[in-house]
């Protein structure tokens, strides 16, 4: 008999190559039963997770399996990171595994930035 | 220096489809994003859709049946065509850049905008 | 869909006022624009990101707010400020615009 828990399948290690400037959709792949859980995105932050709050999330229902998407429109470099999706159900927590983002800047690839421009804006050093 | 010019019939008639163009110049359509907006007389702004970088795009749900945005990145041209055009659809239609900094996305630079009446 | 309510709908000032537009959103967003449109021109960007000055911009302009609730401040109105001026978010598709805010002189 399947088990009815809720699962979150996340590979362990998972992570996405991106580009700054596209959208990207993050797939969260849910497994559930009867009732469809809750699921909450958050990006970490050192030990802790950050719910993401004002974010742009989605389902998208498939035969054996649904998926929770977090929206990126477009990608920024400050969405480089770790992140994870929990899902509470019948008041138990479930985690996932976190998937890591990488992004890389496309106008800084391109325009070669100057020093000073470097000194004032780091991130451009992502990738 | 960046420009984005909108070009395309002044009049169309009800049920006809609209076909605008962007022209842009000091940038690449490869590494900005396009959108369209657009402003009936006296009213307020109205995103309609975008033409990402990659090739991708996204639209304004209430308008997605209606809209098709193409782009030819080597004519640096970006193309909106609305279908089933109708005189609430009458406006100041304007394409604009898309740009990112590290946290946040905005349009921050606006073609003149070309008005297109719709009327039999 | 963010519904974006601007108030006052019409703000009669004089040259030289302090002026305070208001922008609330129906859901939380990250950050909000603020553009400025003058008759018979393209809306040009004024503040980025709730409090970031577009290039040009003079310093007299101001931003802040966070959550549903955001403000664009002129603290010493010049005449070349009176404009229609339109809140902008860029949280959730459809990316939607406040109706607008008259600034005219009094």
């Known amino acids: 008999k399947e088990s009815c828990d809720v699962q979150l399948y996340i590979k362990r290690q998972s992570e996405h190559s991106i580009l700054a400037g596209d959208p990207f959709e993050l797939e969260c792949p849910v497994k559930y039963c009867a009732n469809r859980p809750h699921v909450t995105w958050c990006k970490l932050n050192g030990t802790t997770c950050v719910k993401l709050e004002d974010r742009q999330t989605s389902w998208k229902e498939e035969k054996n399996i649904s998926f929770f998407i977090l929206h990126f429109e477009p990608v920024l470099p400050n969405d480089n990171g770790s992140y994870r999706c929990s899902a509470n159900f019948q008041s138990n927590l479930i985690e996932s595994h976190s998937t890591t983002l990488y992004v890389t800047d496309v106008k800084s690839a391109s325009e070669r930035p100057s020093k000073d421009e470097m000194a004032s804006r780091p991130w451009l050093l992502y990738r | 220096q960046v420009t984005l010019k909108e070009s395309g019939p002044a009049l169309v008639k009800p049920t006809q489809t609209l076909t605008l163009t962007c022209t842009v110049s000091g940038f690449s359509l490869t590494t900005y994003g396009v959108h369209w907006i657009r402003q009936p007389p006296g009213k307020a702004l109205e995103w309609l859709g975008v033409?990402?970088?990659?090739?991708?795009?996204s639209y304004n749900p209430s308008l997605k049946s209606r809209l098709t945005i193409t782009k030819d990145n080597s004519k640096s041209q970006v193309v909106l065509t609305m279908t089933n055009m109708d005189p609430v659809d009458t406006a100041t239609y304007y394409c604009?850049?898309?740009?990112?900094?590290?946290?946040?996305?905005?349009?921050?630079?606006w073609g003149q905008g070309t008005l297109v009446t719709v009327s039999s | 869909e963010i519904v974006l309510t601007q108030s006052p709908a019409t703000l009669s000032l004089s040259p030289g006022e302090r002026a305070t537009l208001s922008c609330r959103a129906s859901s939380s967003v990250s950050y909000m624009h603020w553009y400025q449109q003058k008759p018979g021109q393209a809306p040009r960007p004024l503040i980025y990101?709730?409090?970031n000055r577009a290039t040009g911009i003079p310093a007299r302009f101001s931003g802040s707010g966070s959550g549903t609730d955001y403000t664009l401040t002129i603290s010493s109105l010049e005449p070349e400020d009176f404009a229609v001026y339109y809140c902008h978010q860029w949280s959730s598709n459809p990316y939607t615009f406040g109706q607008g805010t008259k600034l005219e002189i009094k």
């Open positions: 033409m990402w970088p990659g090739g991708r795009t």
């Open positions: 604009v850049r898309g740009d990112y900094e590290y946290d946040y996305y905005a349009m921050d630079y």
């Open positions: 990101a709730t409090s």
